[in-house]
Protein backbone atom coordinates (compact mmCIF):
# COMPACT_ATOMS: atom_id res chain seq x y z
CA UNK A 1 0.00 0.00 0.00
CA UNK A 2 1.36 3.52 -0.43
CA UNK A 3 3.02 4.97 2.56
CA UNK A 4 3.03 8.09 4.62
CA UNK A 5 0.29 10.71 4.39
CA UNK A 6 -3.27 15.75 0.77
CA UNK A 7 -5.70 16.35 2.40
CA UNK A 8 -8.18 19.65 2.16
CA UNK A 9 -5.82 20.65 -0.78
CA UNK A 10 -6.47 20.94 -4.58
CA UNK A 11 -5.59 20.05 -7.53
CA UNK A 12 -2.07 21.49 -9.02
CA UNK A 13 -1.76 23.41 -11.75
CA UNK A 14 -0.43 20.84 -14.65
CA UNK A 15 3.37 20.27 -14.67
CA UNK A 16 3.90 23.79 -12.47
CA UNK A 17 5.98 21.55 -10.10
CA UNK A 18 8.22 19.74 -12.50
CA UNK A 19 10.34 18.70 -9.95
CA UNK A 20 7.93 16.32 -8.35
CA UNK A 21 8.55 12.62 -9.04
CA UNK A 22 6.30 9.00 -8.10
CA UNK A 23 8.15 6.81 -6.53
CA UNK A 24 6.62 3.43 -7.94
CA UNK A 25 6.27 0.08 -6.86
CA UNK A 26 5.50 -2.55 -9.90
CA UNK A 27 3.85 0.29 -11.71
CA UNK A 28 1.61 1.73 -9.00
CA UNK A 29 2.39 5.00 -7.11
CA UNK A 30 3.97 4.00 -3.52
CA UNK A 31 5.43 7.40 -2.71
CA UNK A 32 6.63 10.95 -3.19
CA UNK A 33 9.92 11.81 -4.06
CA UNK A 34 11.68 15.55 -5.87
CA UNK A 35 14.05 15.91 -8.58
CA UNK A 36 17.15 17.19 -6.61
CA UNK A 37 19.88 16.61 -9.45
CA UNK A 38 19.63 15.20 -13.45
CA UNK A 39 20.07 11.82 -12.20
CA UNK A 40 18.99 11.96 -8.57
CA UNK A 41 15.72 11.74 -6.68
CA UNK A 42 15.41 12.78 -2.79
CA UNK A 43 12.39 10.27 -1.22
CA UNK A 44 11.89 9.26 2.07
CA UNK A 45 14.01 5.94 3.40
CA UNK A 46 10.52 3.97 4.81
CA UNK A 47 9.21 3.98 1.22
CA UNK A 48 11.08 1.60 0.65
CA UNK A 49 10.49 -0.78 3.30
CA UNK A 50 8.36 -3.31 1.80
CA UNK A 51 10.06 -2.97 -1.09
CA UNK A 52 12.27 -6.24 -1.11
CA UNK A 53 11.13 -7.91 -3.98
CA UNK A 54 9.52 -4.97 -6.32
CA UNK A 55 10.73 -3.57 -8.87
CA UNK A 56 11.26 0.52 -8.02
CA UNK A 57 10.68 2.90 -10.84
CA UNK A 58 10.55 6.94 -11.14
CA UNK A 59 7.77 9.00 -12.85
CA UNK A 60 8.99 12.16 -13.86
CA UNK A 61 6.75 14.92 -15.97
CA UNK A 62 4.01 13.42 -14.41
CA UNK A 63 0.48 15.28 -13.40
CA UNK A 64 -1.82 12.84 -14.21
CA UNK A 65 -0.58 8.72 -13.11
CA UNK A 66 -2.41 7.76 -15.62
CA UNK A 67 -3.12 9.49 -18.87
CA UNK A 68 -0.47 9.73 -21.19
CA UNK A 69 1.58 12.80 -21.35
CA UNK A 70 4.21 14.26 -23.74
CA UNK A 71 6.58 14.72 -20.92
CA UNK A 72 5.62 11.72 -18.56
CA UNK A 73 9.03 9.16 -18.51
CA UNK A 74 9.47 6.27 -16.34
CA UNK A 75 13.04 5.59 -14.97
CA UNK A 76 14.47 2.71 -13.88
CA UNK A 77 16.30 2.93 -10.47
CA UNK A 78 20.34 1.80 -10.63
CA UNK A 79 20.76 2.73 -6.97
CA UNK A 80 18.99 3.32 -3.69
CA UNK A 81 20.57 4.53 -0.81
CA UNK A 82 19.14 4.97 2.11
CA UNK A 83 20.24 7.12 5.31
CA UNK A 84 22.58 5.35 7.04
CA UNK A 85 21.00 5.50 9.85
CA UNK A 86 16.98 5.19 9.17
CA UNK A 87 15.27 2.83 10.55
CA UNK A 88 11.77 1.17 10.30
CA UNK A 89 10.62 2.04 14.22
CA UNK A 90 11.73 6.01 14.36
CA UNK A 91 10.99 8.90 11.64
CA UNK A 92 14.63 10.43 12.59
CA UNK A 93 16.63 10.62 9.34
CA UNK A 94 13.75 9.11 6.55
CA UNK A 95 15.80 10.19 3.71
CA UNK A 96 16.66 8.08 0.44
CA UNK A 97 17.80 9.34 -2.69
CA UNK A 98 17.21 7.25 -5.74
CA UNK A 99 19.46 7.44 -9.23
CA UNK A 100 18.06 6.93 -11.96
CA UNK A 101 19.33 4.19 -14.40
CA UNK A 102 20.27 8.03 -16.79
CA UNK A 103 20.16 11.60 -16.21
CA UNK A 104 16.50 12.76 -16.74
CA UNK A 105 15.39 14.71 -19.84
CA UNK A 106 15.10 18.29 -18.71
CA UNK A 107 12.42 20.58 -20.07
CA UNK A 108 9.24 22.39 -19.09
CA UNK A 109 8.02 19.24 -16.82
CA UNK A 110 10.84 18.31 -15.63
CA UNK A 111 13.60 20.09 -13.61
CA UNK A 112 15.44 19.95 -10.31
CA UNK A 113 14.54 21.99 -7.37
CA UNK A 114 17.11 24.06 -5.81
CA UNK A 115 17.62 22.59 -1.79
CA UNK A 116 18.19 24.48 1.27
CA UNK A 117 21.53 24.27 2.56
CA UNK A 118 21.65 26.70 4.47
CA UNK A 119 20.78 24.72 8.32
CA UNK A 120 17.87 27.01 9.78
CA UNK A 121 14.92 26.88 10.70
CA UNK A 122 11.98 28.27 8.96
CA UNK A 123 10.04 31.04 10.60
CA UNK A 124 6.56 29.44 12.27
CA UNK A 125 3.92 30.90 10.27
CA UNK A 126 5.60 30.63 6.51
CA UNK A 127 3.50 29.29 4.45
CA UNK A 128 5.16 26.29 2.66
CA UNK A 129 3.71 24.01 -0.53
CA UNK A 130 3.31 20.20 -0.18
CA UNK A 131 2.52 18.57 -2.93
CA UNK A 132 1.41 14.38 -3.82
CA UNK A 133 -0.68 11.83 -5.02
CA UNK A 134 -1.51 10.84 -1.73
CA UNK A 135 -4.77 9.60 -0.12
CA UNK A 136 -7.46 12.71 -0.09
CA UNK A 137 -10.23 11.61 2.01
CA UNK A 138 -10.23 9.65 5.05
CA UNK A 139 -11.98 7.17 3.30
CA UNK A 140 -8.63 6.16 1.32
CA UNK A 141 -9.21 7.67 -1.94
CA UNK A 142 -6.22 7.97 -3.99
CA UNK A 143 -6.41 10.74 -6.74
CA UNK A 144 -4.96 10.47 -10.91
CA UNK A 145 -3.76 13.73 -10.81
CA UNK A 146 -1.47 16.03 -8.43
CA UNK A 147 -2.87 17.37 -5.62
CA UNK A 148 -1.31 20.13 -3.49
CA UNK A 149 -2.23 22.16 -0.03
CA UNK A 150 0.16 25.84 1.46
CA UNK A 151 0.64 24.81 4.56
CA UNK A 152 1.97 27.09 7.66
CA UNK A 153 4.87 25.76 9.70
CA UNK A 154 4.44 25.12 13.19
CA UNK A 155 7.24 26.55 15.59
CA UNK A 156 8.97 23.17 17.05
CA UNK A 157 8.22 23.62 20.79
CA UNK A 158 4.32 23.71 20.24
CA UNK A 159 4.85 20.44 17.80
CA UNK A 160 6.80 18.94 20.95
CA UNK A 161 4.14 19.38 23.15
CA UNK A 162 2.83 16.17 24.83
CA UNK A 163 -0.46 16.14 23.37
CA UNK A 164 1.10 16.52 19.78
CA UNK A 165 4.37 14.73 18.89
CA UNK A 166 5.59 14.78 22.63
CA UNK A 167 9.62 15.30 21.92
CA UNK A 168 10.03 13.23 19.03
CA UNK A 169 10.74 16.30 16.47
CA UNK A 170 14.33 16.69 16.22
CA UNK A 171 16.53 19.70 15.21
CA UNK A 172 16.51 17.53 12.14
CA UNK A 173 12.72 17.61 11.81
CA UNK A 174 9.89 20.64 11.49
CA UNK A 175 6.42 20.38 11.41
CA UNK A 176 3.20 21.94 9.46
CA UNK A 177 -0.01 22.59 10.82
CA UNK A 178 -2.52 19.93 10.13
CA UNK A 179 -5.88 21.44 10.51
CA UNK A 180 -8.22 19.49 8.29
CA UNK A 181 -5.36 20.51 5.37
CA UNK A 182 -2.60 18.24 5.83
CA UNK A 183 -0.38 15.60 3.68
CA UNK A 184 -1.77 12.27 4.09
CA UNK A 185 -0.64 8.72 3.21
CA UNK A 186 0.90 8.24 -0.21
CA UNK A 187 2.38 12.02 0.38
CA UNK A 188 5.91 10.17 2.08
CA UNK A 189 9.04 11.38 0.46
CA UNK A 190 7.30 14.43 -1.34
CA UNK A 191 8.09 17.93 -0.59
CA UNK A 192 7.81 20.75 1.31
CA UNK A 193 8.35 23.93 -0.63
CA UNK A 194 9.15 27.09 1.26
CA UNK A 195 9.84 30.38 -1.03
CA UNK A 196 10.67 27.89 -4.32
CA UNK A 197 13.14 26.28 -1.89
CA UNK A 198 12.98 22.61 -1.01
CA UNK A 199 12.95 22.66 3.01
CA UNK A 200 11.68 19.34 4.23
CA UNK A 201 10.49 15.53 3.05
CA UNK A 202 7.27 14.06 3.80
CA UNK A 203 8.50 11.78 6.57
CA UNK A 204 6.72 8.17 6.15
CA UNK A 205 5.98 7.45 9.84
CA UNK A 206 2.36 6.44 10.15
CA UNK A 207 -0.03 9.08 11.63
CA UNK A 208 -3.90 10.42 11.43
CA UNK A 209 -4.33 12.98 9.14
CA UNK A 210 -5.73 16.37 9.32
CA UNK A 211 -5.81 16.05 13.11
CA UNK A 212 -4.81 19.64 14.29
CA UNK A 213 -2.80 18.51 17.30
CA UNK A 214 -0.78 15.64 15.12
CA UNK A 215 0.83 18.36 12.85
CA UNK A 216 2.60 16.44 9.55
CA UNK A 217 6.51 16.27 10.16
CA UNK A 218 8.94 16.95 7.86
CA UNK A 219 12.36 16.02 7.81
CA UNK A 220 14.89 18.93 7.32
CA UNK A 221 16.94 18.74 4.35
CA UNK A 222 19.36 21.32 5.05
CA UNK A 223 20.20 19.28 8.37
CA UNK A 224 21.54 16.40 5.78
CA UNK A 225 23.16 18.84 3.38
CA UNK A 226 26.35 17.13 3.76
CA UNK A 227 24.95 13.20 3.55
CA UNK A 228 23.00 14.15 -0.30
CA UNK A 229 26.09 15.99 -1.16
CA UNK A 230 28.33 12.86 -0.48
CA UNK A 231 26.02 10.84 -2.28
CA UNK A 232 25.39 12.63 -4.51
CA UNK A 233 29.42 13.39 -5.53
CA UNK B 1 22.85 16.29 28.94
CA UNK B 2 19.56 17.47 29.94
CA UNK B 3 19.59 19.78 32.62
CA UNK B 4 16.92 22.72 34.22
CA UNK B 5 19.12 24.83 36.65
CA UNK B 6 17.01 26.74 38.96
CA UNK B 7 17.56 29.89 41.35
CA UNK B 8 18.60 29.47 45.14
CA UNK B 9 16.01 29.88 47.70
CA UNK B 10 13.97 32.71 48.65
CA UNK B 11 12.87 34.60 52.14
CA UNK B 12 10.08 37.03 51.02
CA UNK B 13 8.02 39.75 53.44
CA UNK B 14 4.38 39.00 52.88
CA UNK B 15 2.73 41.48 50.16
CA UNK B 16 6.18 41.39 47.92
CA UNK B 17 7.09 39.58 44.78
CA UNK B 18 9.69 37.45 43.81
CA UNK B 19 10.96 36.03 40.59
CA UNK B 20 12.47 32.69 40.48
CA UNK B 21 14.61 31.34 37.18
CA UNK B 22 15.36 28.27 35.44
CA UNK B 23 18.12 27.74 32.76
CA UNK B 24 18.33 25.38 30.72
CA UNK B 25 21.30 23.58 29.17
CA UNK B 26 21.97 20.56 26.76
CA UNK B 27 19.02 21.31 24.20
CA UNK B 28 17.78 23.91 22.32
CA UNK B 29 16.09 26.62 24.95
CA UNK B 30 13.24 27.21 22.16
CA UNK B 31 12.39 23.65 21.10
CA UNK B 32 10.22 22.74 23.89
CA UNK B 33 7.40 24.34 26.16
CA UNK B 34 8.71 25.36 30.18
CA UNK B 35 5.78 24.31 32.44
CA UNK B 36 6.13 25.12 36.09
CA UNK B 37 4.59 23.53 38.85
CA UNK B 38 4.24 24.41 42.84
CA UNK B 39 4.50 21.54 45.86
CA UNK B 40 3.59 22.88 49.65
CA UNK B 41 5.15 21.44 51.82
CA UNK B 42 3.34 17.88 52.93
CA UNK B 43 1.08 17.90 49.55
CA UNK B 44 0.92 16.91 45.69
CA UNK B 45 2.01 19.17 42.88
CA UNK B 46 0.17 22.13 41.09
CA UNK B 47 0.33 23.22 37.80
CA UNK B 48 0.50 26.54 37.74
CA UNK B 49 1.09 27.32 34.30
CA UNK B 50 3.46 27.05 30.70
CA UNK B 51 5.19 29.11 28.05
CA UNK B 52 6.26 28.82 24.61
CA UNK B 53 9.79 30.03 24.10
CA UNK B 54 9.67 31.01 20.62
CA UNK B 55 6.71 33.32 21.23
CA UNK B 56 6.33 34.20 25.04
CA UNK B 57 2.85 33.20 25.09
CA UNK B 58 1.84 31.65 28.32
CA UNK B 59 -1.03 29.74 29.55
CA UNK B 60 -2.61 29.82 33.13
CA UNK B 61 -3.96 27.80 35.61
CA UNK B 62 -7.22 29.86 36.44
CA UNK B 63 -6.09 29.46 40.58
CA UNK B 64 -2.90 31.25 39.52
CA UNK B 65 -3.93 34.06 37.02
CA UNK B 66 -2.52 37.22 38.62
CA UNK B 67 -0.55 35.59 40.49
CA UNK B 68 2.18 34.13 38.48
CA UNK B 69 3.49 36.06 35.37
CA UNK B 70 5.82 33.33 33.07
CA UNK B 71 8.57 35.27 30.59
CA UNK B 72 10.97 33.58 28.42
CA UNK B 73 14.63 34.94 27.98
CA UNK B 74 15.64 33.38 24.57
CA UNK B 75 19.65 35.21 24.80
CA UNK B 76 20.29 33.51 28.12
CA UNK B 77 17.95 30.10 27.21
CA UNK B 78 16.28 31.31 30.40
CA UNK B 79 12.59 30.79 31.71
CA UNK B 80 11.36 32.95 34.44
CA UNK B 81 8.37 33.29 36.90
CA UNK B 82 7.41 36.08 39.04
CA UNK B 83 4.54 35.66 41.98
CA UNK B 84 3.43 38.34 43.67
CA UNK B 85 1.50 39.71 46.70
CA UNK B 86 2.47 37.16 48.45
CA UNK B 87 1.47 35.18 51.46
CA UNK B 88 1.81 32.70 53.66
CA UNK B 89 0.23 30.28 51.34
CA UNK B 90 2.39 31.10 48.74
CA UNK B 91 5.26 28.96 50.64
CA UNK B 92 6.47 26.44 48.60
CA UNK B 93 9.13 24.29 46.58
CA UNK B 94 8.39 25.82 42.87
CA UNK B 95 9.32 23.27 39.89
CA UNK B 96 10.38 24.43 35.88
CA UNK B 97 9.80 21.09 34.10
CA UNK B 98 10.18 20.44 29.90
CA UNK B 99 7.30 19.24 27.97
CA UNK B 100 8.34 16.56 25.72
CA UNK B 101 8.34 13.69 25.95
CA UNK B 102 5.61 14.11 29.04
CA UNK B 103 7.52 16.23 32.08
CA UNK B 104 11.08 13.99 31.74
CA UNK B 105 12.86 16.62 32.99
CA UNK B 106 12.43 19.04 36.27
CA UNK B 107 14.62 21.47 38.25
CA UNK B 108 15.60 21.17 41.45
CA UNK B 109 12.65 22.92 43.02
CA UNK B 110 13.66 26.43 44.19
CA UNK B 111 11.80 27.14 47.95
CA UNK B 112 9.97 30.08 48.46
CA UNK B 113 9.05 31.29 51.71
CA UNK B 114 7.05 34.23 52.84
CA UNK B 115 7.73 35.22 56.25
CA UNK B 116 7.79 38.38 57.92
CA UNK C 1 -11.07 20.64 36.54
CA UNK C 2 -10.51 17.31 36.19
CA UNK C 3 -9.84 15.80 40.08
CA UNK C 4 -7.52 12.76 39.95
CA UNK C 5 -8.09 10.09 43.00
CA UNK C 6 -5.53 7.64 44.29
CA UNK C 7 -5.40 4.82 46.10
CA UNK C 8 -4.02 3.83 49.08
CA UNK C 9 -2.22 7.00 50.49
CA UNK C 10 0.21 4.82 52.03
CA UNK C 11 1.34 1.54 50.70
CA UNK C 12 3.96 -0.04 53.44
CA UNK C 13 5.10 -3.40 51.36
CA UNK C 14 8.30 -5.72 52.21
CA UNK C 15 11.11 -5.62 49.52
CA UNK C 16 10.30 -8.24 46.65
CA UNK C 17 6.48 -8.03 47.05
CA UNK C 18 4.55 -6.72 44.13
CA UNK C 19 2.60 -3.09 44.53
CA UNK C 20 -0.09 -1.83 43.22
CA UNK C 21 -1.24 2.00 42.98
CA UNK C 22 -4.79 2.84 41.72
CA UNK C 23 -5.79 6.45 40.12
CA UNK C 24 -8.96 7.62 39.32
CA UNK C 25 -9.89 10.53 37.14
CA UNK C 26 -12.91 12.85 37.62
CA UNK C 27 -14.38 12.57 34.02
CA UNK C 28 -12.36 10.80 30.72
CA UNK C 29 -9.29 11.67 30.32
CA UNK C 30 -9.21 10.26 26.76
CA UNK C 31 -7.86 13.38 24.69
CA UNK C 32 -9.73 15.03 21.50
CA UNK C 33 -7.11 13.02 19.23
CA UNK C 34 -7.48 10.05 20.47
CA UNK C 35 -4.82 9.65 22.74
CA UNK C 36 -4.82 9.33 26.65
CA UNK C 37 -2.18 11.34 28.74
CA UNK C 38 -2.19 9.87 32.24
CA UNK C 39 1.47 9.50 33.58
CA UNK C 40 3.01 8.30 36.35
CA UNK C 41 5.40 9.86 38.54
CA UNK C 42 8.18 8.95 41.68
CA UNK C 43 9.57 11.95 43.82
CA UNK C 44 11.78 10.77 45.94
CA UNK C 45 12.68 12.43 49.51
CA UNK C 46 13.78 16.15 48.91
CA UNK C 47 14.36 15.23 44.91
CA UNK C 48 12.46 16.56 42.17
CA UNK C 49 9.75 14.12 40.46
CA UNK C 50 11.23 11.63 38.00
CA UNK C 51 8.66 10.33 34.69
CA UNK C 52 8.12 6.23 34.92
CA UNK C 53 4.99 5.96 32.74
CA UNK C 54 3.15 8.10 29.83
CA UNK C 55 0.46 8.04 27.98
CA UNK C 56 -0.77 5.25 30.44
CA UNK C 57 1.41 2.28 30.05
CA UNK C 58 4.63 3.34 27.73
CA UNK C 59 7.76 3.35 30.20
CA UNK C 60 10.06 5.87 29.63
CA UNK C 61 13.51 5.41 28.73
CA UNK C 62 15.76 3.78 31.51
CA UNK C 63 12.88 2.75 33.58
CA UNK C 64 12.99 -1.09 35.01
CA UNK C 65 10.76 -3.43 33.70
CA UNK C 66 9.08 -4.05 36.84
CA UNK C 67 6.89 -0.88 36.66
CA UNK C 68 3.85 -1.11 34.47
CA UNK C 69 0.91 0.89 33.70
CA UNK C 70 -2.53 -0.13 32.69
CA UNK C 71 -6.01 1.31 32.21
CA UNK C 72 -8.20 3.16 30.19
CA UNK C 73 -11.40 5.47 30.84
CA UNK C 74 -11.03 7.40 34.26
CA UNK C 75 -9.40 4.07 35.79
CA UNK C 76 -5.79 3.73 36.18
CA UNK C 77 -3.14 1.35 37.27
CA UNK C 78 0.57 0.92 38.10
CA UNK C 79 1.90 -1.60 39.29
CA UNK C 80 5.32 -2.92 40.71
CA UNK C 81 6.48 -6.26 40.12
CA UNK C 82 8.81 -6.91 43.14
CA UNK C 83 9.77 -3.76 45.12
CA UNK C 84 13.06 -2.85 45.84
CA UNK C 85 14.76 -0.28 47.93
CA UNK C 86 14.80 2.80 45.31
CA UNK C 87 11.44 2.29 44.58
CA UNK C 88 10.51 4.23 48.03
CA UNK C 89 9.34 7.17 47.82
CA UNK C 90 5.68 8.94 46.90
CA UNK C 91 4.12 7.90 43.64
CA UNK C 92 1.73 10.79 41.96
CA UNK C 93 -0.55 10.12 38.34
CA UNK C 94 -0.53 12.54 36.07
CA UNK C 95 -3.40 13.76 33.59
CA UNK C 96 -2.68 16.18 30.67
CA UNK C 97 -5.72 15.56 28.25
CA UNK C 98 -7.18 18.26 29.69
CA UNK C 99 -6.32 22.09 31.09
CA UNK C 100 -5.27 22.63 33.48
CA UNK C 101 -3.21 19.14 33.75
CA UNK C 102 -3.61 17.95 37.22
CA UNK C 103 -1.97 15.85 39.54
CA UNK C 104 -3.36 12.89 41.61
CA UNK C 105 -2.87 13.70 45.99
CA UNK C 106 -0.18 10.96 45.61
CA UNK C 107 0.70 7.23 47.19
CA UNK C 108 3.25 6.95 49.97
CA UNK C 109 5.41 3.61 49.06
CA UNK C 110 7.08 2.65 52.21
CA UNK C 111 8.67 -0.38 54.00
CA UNK C 112 6.06 -2.65 56.28
Known amino acids: PPRGRILGGREAEAHARPYMASVQLNGAHLCGGVLVAEQWVLSAAHCLEDAADGKVQVLLGAHSLSQPEPSKRLYDVLRAVPHPDSQPDTIDHDLLLLQLSEKATLGPAVRPLPWQRVDRDVAPGTLCDVAGWGIVNHAGRRPDSLQHVLLPVLDRATCNRRTHHDGAITERLMCAESNRRDSCKGDSGGPLVCGGVLEGVVTSGSRVCGNRKKPGIYTRVASYAAWIDSVLA | EVQLQQSGPELVKPGASVKISCKAF????????KNWMRQRHGESLEWIGDINPNSGDANYNQKFKGKATLTVDKSSSTAYMELRSLTSEDSAVYYC?????????WGHGTLVTVSA | DVLMTQTPLSLPVSLGDQASISCRSS???????????LEWYLQKPGQSPNLLIY???NRFSGVPDRFSGSGSGTDFTLKISRVEAEDLGIYYCFQGSHVPPTFGGGTKLEIK
Open chain 3, 27 to 37: QTIVHSNGDTY
Open chain 2, 26 to 33: GYTFTDYY
Open chain 2, 97 to 105: AREGPSFAY
Open chain 3, 55 to 57: KVS
